[in-house]
Structure formats: C-alpha cells, structure tokens
C-alpha cells in the first residue's frame, strides 16, 4: 500500500468512532438488542480500541438472546427447541396449540399456517408482533413506516463508511447515497468487495486486487487497464528480406521469403539445409530459390516423382523445354 | 509514482465553452476517482466534480449546470467542460487523483491557467 | 453545504516555533473525513494529513492532526523553512468536497 495504513481502521487511530459506527473499523451499528448493556439504550459512540460494544451481529430486534442467534443483520434463527419469528416459542407448545390451520392426520394437531409475520415483513432489523387484524413493525432508531422501509438516516448522520463520500438530495432530509472508495460497496460503503469476482480483466487477462488499486495483467498481444485493447499484432513489426506478417494469437510471426528465416526474417537462411530434393536429388542454391537436379529415375521440382521406364512420367507431360532429369527451379 | 498533466487552451472568450484534459501516466485510470479543482489567483480551493470508471460522477451544485467530466479508459484521460464562462472562471485548474481511503485529493497536476478573455 | 473556516488567516512565526492552526466546521463532519493540504507559491497543494489524525506517505511526523466533530487543528511541531506556506483544511465526508479559505505561514 502507498499509503501508512493498509486498512481504514488505522486512520481512526484512537479517536472515538461518530454514531452510528462502532467496532474497530467502525462499521457495525450498536443496538440495544444486540450489544452489551454498557452502551446503554440506543446508539452510542464506541471506541475502537477498548472494543467497547465490539458486539454480535445486530439480530432482528426482539430476537431472544438465550434461544435465538444470527449470522446475517437482521436475522433470527432459533436453537433446537425454540421456534417462532423471535424463537421465544418452544416447539413442543407451539406444534400443538396453534390456534391456526388445519390438523394433521398422524398427530392430531393442529398444523401451524402461514403467519402475518412469517418470513419477518419488517425490513431494516425491524421486530414484527401480531395485530388482530394483522401486524406491526418496530423500527430500530433511523428507519419509519409500515414495514421500516423507509430510512430517516441523512448525510448528517455520518452513514458512509470505509472512506465514502455521503451525497445527499436536494433538501438536507432527504435521502442519501454514499458514493464507496474502489474496493467497497453497499448502501454504506461497508462491505469490501472481491473486484476480481466480477472479472473485470478481459481477453484472459490476469486479475489482481491490490486493495488499493486493481491490475490487470494482459496476455500477450492485448493491453489497457482492462486488457480490452487487442493489439494489431503485425502493427510497428515489419518483416525484412520480404517476408509477410501474420497475424495470430495475441503475437506475430512471419512467413519468410525463400533463403531467409528466423522472428523477423533477419536471419539468412540456407535453402538446401532442410534437404528439399528427394530421391537423391542434389540441392543448389539460386538466388531466386533453391533448384533440384534429380537423380536419373525422378523428376518435379523436389525430384519427387519417378518417371516411368517407358519414358511416361506419373505427372502430366513435362512443361515444354524441360527435359525429365533436367534440373528444376523450386519456386 | 502516477503523474498528471493537464492540458488545454490558456485562454477563452467569455460565454465559450472551457475544455480541459488531464491526462494520468499510467494504466490506473479505472482503479481511483479522478477529480477537477481550481483555484482562482490569490484565492482558495474550489472542487468542481469528480468521476470513476463505472461512470459514477459528482458535480459541485454551484457549477453542475454547466459542467461535464467525462473520462476515456482507453486513452488514460479525463475532461472537464465548462460552458457559458465568465470573468469568474479565470483560475488555476488542477485534475487530482482521489486518495484511495476517501475524497481527499493525494496526486495533483502542476495546474493549467485558464484566462477568460475577449 | 459544510463551509470550512480557518483561523488565523496569517501565522507569522519564525522557523523552530510551534505553529497550531485551526479549521471549525458549520456542520459536524462525519467519521473525522478531513484532510490537510499545504501549498507553496506557484505549486499545487501536497496532501499532508487525512482522517483527522494520519499522516500521507512521506510526511514528516513534526506534522499532526487532532480534533473530531466540528474542531479540527493541525500543529507543526517546528518550522522548518520549507514549511512556510498555505495550508488548507477539507472536508470529505458529505458532498459537496469543500475546503477552508486557507492559513498563510509567513516568516516573522
């Protein structure tokens, strides 16, 4: 990292995070429900460093501390035994006395159905309790309405975590976004992301969070912060002595002219080295290419083909001038 | 260490439009935000808008109705137009780097004076 | 808006002295997102302090920086020459960025 600290938790330093931040990076919000009773009711400034409410996640509110846990905000799971929204039922009373829903055939009792707070309509880690008619939410501080949708939270609150920039509407009540530093996302910039994961690297590139800073490393014949740039691979890359530039790959060759190899075609190549003329044939080098001079027996440009003993070759008839056994241009 | 170099033209004719390009020495346009800033002489610090590859941008309420920051991966640049400019935009404009840990500014350009002038 | 003011406008003081200079905000700047910045003549502004309190690569420790809330103070512990100059205080925590008239140190 450039910079002194590697993660936002140092800048804080000392300092008391604002509300309602709290834990060592100050991201975790301090609830009643969910905390020690030392921060008292509501929402209190925690200090990072004494990990002062360095609580549980926040639970739904209501959710019983003795019978109920969580592994997400706003959520309540029951330990074996207990059931219901807040796992305040057991489940031996609660699988017979249900007021509602039909009987079962094999025990007898009375099948729970669904109720107006199964599945917890309360957003925000709002508690939700059965009304006659229906039901109610209660919001956790900074969220109203029927189902705590709605979030009471402005920029004047500080929501913004992990470095981001909190923008508000038009008028200072009005709703916020937080605008996240690379590296971060969610409404209040608190989770950290993999920004590998969303494979932002294209072309096969290589990937690699630096936490600061994302890189993609490109294959060959590509570039671009995001590799998204194939190269004209033959692009700056003549090829000498005549030779042509193919393309391919993400990288270049070229195909040589005759007598000269190597990447570029720099190297001066001997035609005859790879012994092209078959049958016996012996090679000479031409300057316009290699030429053969078949063995008595065989004609065609590499001696390749036998003539026949009555005098037929097994080609078409000889090109006009060119006498079978007479040396032949290979072009 | 990144550098960047403003560029544009020194002076513009009032009610034109200024065009500024920054450009980052770098392959890591698409890894911070970039921002504008200016500073007219003898006066203090004035953000103007900033912008990140995704295309998330934010413009200063005082100048949003005639800003745009756009920025282009492929070149390692960003701009900034500024229309209808008056004898108030004449200043020092600097393009920054937003520091990684939140909206301060670590890498500045050395600054391009814009004058507004017929 | 968070408009930014700084106190004093000018700082005379000659070079070994402890200079304190302060940036109060109108409103509450949240999670202490506030950034130092020094300027010389002629230069663009180098970023000295952020988060209040930390220090940017390549600082030296005779800078620091304190406060929370709406007070915010950064203390050059001993002027050296080069720290004759304009400093400035930003605020980063809700949009839009602003930045404080600045404080000039000048040579007593």
């Known amino acids: 990292y450039p910079y002194d600290v590697p993660d936002y938790a140092g800048m804080l330093g000392s300092a008391r995070c604002e509300p309602p931040a709290v834990g060592t990076a100050c991201t975790r919000l301090c609830r009643p429900r969910s905390a020690p009773s030392r921060c008292g009711p509501g929402l209190r400034p925690c200090a990072p460093l004494e990990d002062e409410c360095e609580a549980p996640l926040v639970c739904r509110a209501g959710c019983s501390p003795e019978h109920g846990f969580c592994e997400q905000p706003g959520e309540c799971r029951c330990l074996e035994g207990w059931t219901g929204p807040l796992c305040t039922v057991p489940v031996s009373t609660s699988s017979c006395l249900s007021p509602r829903g039909p009987s079962s055939a094999t025990t007898g009792c009375l099948v729970p159905g669904p109720g107006p707070c199964d599945g917890n309509p309360c957003a925000n880690g709002g508690s939700c309790s059965e009304t006659p008619r229906s039901f109610e939410c209660t919001c956790p501080r900074g969220f109203y309405g029927l189902r705590c949708e709605v979030s009471g939270v402005t920029c004047a609150d500080g929501p913004c975590f992990n470095g981001g920039l909190c923008v508000g509407g038009a008028d200072p009540d009005s709703a916020y976004i937080c605008h996240c530093p690379p590296g971060f996302q969610g409404s209040n910039c608190e989770k950290r992301v993999d920004r590998c994961s969303l494979q932002p690297c294209r072309n096969g590139g290589l990937c690699l969070d630096l936490g600061h800073a994302l890189r993609c490393r490109c294959r060959a014949g590509f570039a671009g912060p995001r590799c998204e740039h194939d190269l004209d691979d033959c692009a700056g890359r003549a090829c000498a002595n005549g030779g042509t530039c193919v393309e391919g790959g993400g990288a270049h060759r070229c195909s040589c002219a005759l007598g000269f190899g190597g990447r570029d075609c720099r190297e001066r190549a001997d035609p005859c080295a790879a012994r092209p003329c078959a049958h016996g044939g012996r090679c000479y080098a031409h300057f316009s290419g290699l030429v053969c001079a078949c063995a008595p027996g065989y004609m065609g440009a590499r001696c390749e083909f036998p003539v026949h003993p009555d005098g037929a070759s097994a080609l078409p008839a000889a090109p006009p001038g060119l006498r079978p056994g007479d040396p032949q241009r290979y072009l | 260490q990144v550098q960047l170099q403003e560029s544009g033209p020194g002076l513009v004719k009032p009610s034109e439009t200024l065009s500024l390009t920054c450009t980052v020495s770098d392959n890591s346009i698409s890894n911070y935000y970039w921002s504008w800033i200016r500073q007219p002489p003898g006066k203090g610090l004035e953000w103007i808008a900033y912008i990140y590859y995704s295309g998330t941008t934010n413009y200063n309420p005082s100048l949003k109705s005639r800003v745009t920051i756009s920025l282009d991966t492929s070149k390692n640049q960003f701009s900034l137009q500024l229309s209808s400019v008056t004898a108030a935009d004449a200043a020092v404009y600097y393009c920054?780097?937003?520091?990684?840990?939140?909206?301060?500014?670590?890498?500045w350009g050395q600054g391009t004076m814009v004058t507004v002038s017929s | 808006e968070i408009v930014l003011t700084q106190s004093p406008g000018t700082l005379s003081l000659s070079p070994g002295e402890r200079a304190t200079l302060s940036c109060r905000a109108s409103q509450r700047v949240s999670n202490t997102y506030l950034a130092w910045y020094q300027q010389n003549p002629g230069q663009a502004p180098r970023l000295l302090i952020y988060g209040a309190s930390s220090r940017a690569t390549g600082i030296p420790d005779r800078f620091s920086g304190s406060g929370s809330g709406t007070d915010f103070t950064l203390t050059i512990s001993r002027l050296e020459p080069e720290d004759f100059a304009v400093y400035y205080c930003?605020?980063?925590?809700?949009?839009?960025?602003?930045f404080g008239g600045g404080t000039k140190v000048e040579i007593k």
């Open positions: 930003q605020q980063y925590g809700t949009s839009p960025l602003t």
């Open positions: 920054a780097r937003v520091f990684h840990w939140g909206f301060a500014f670590d890498i």
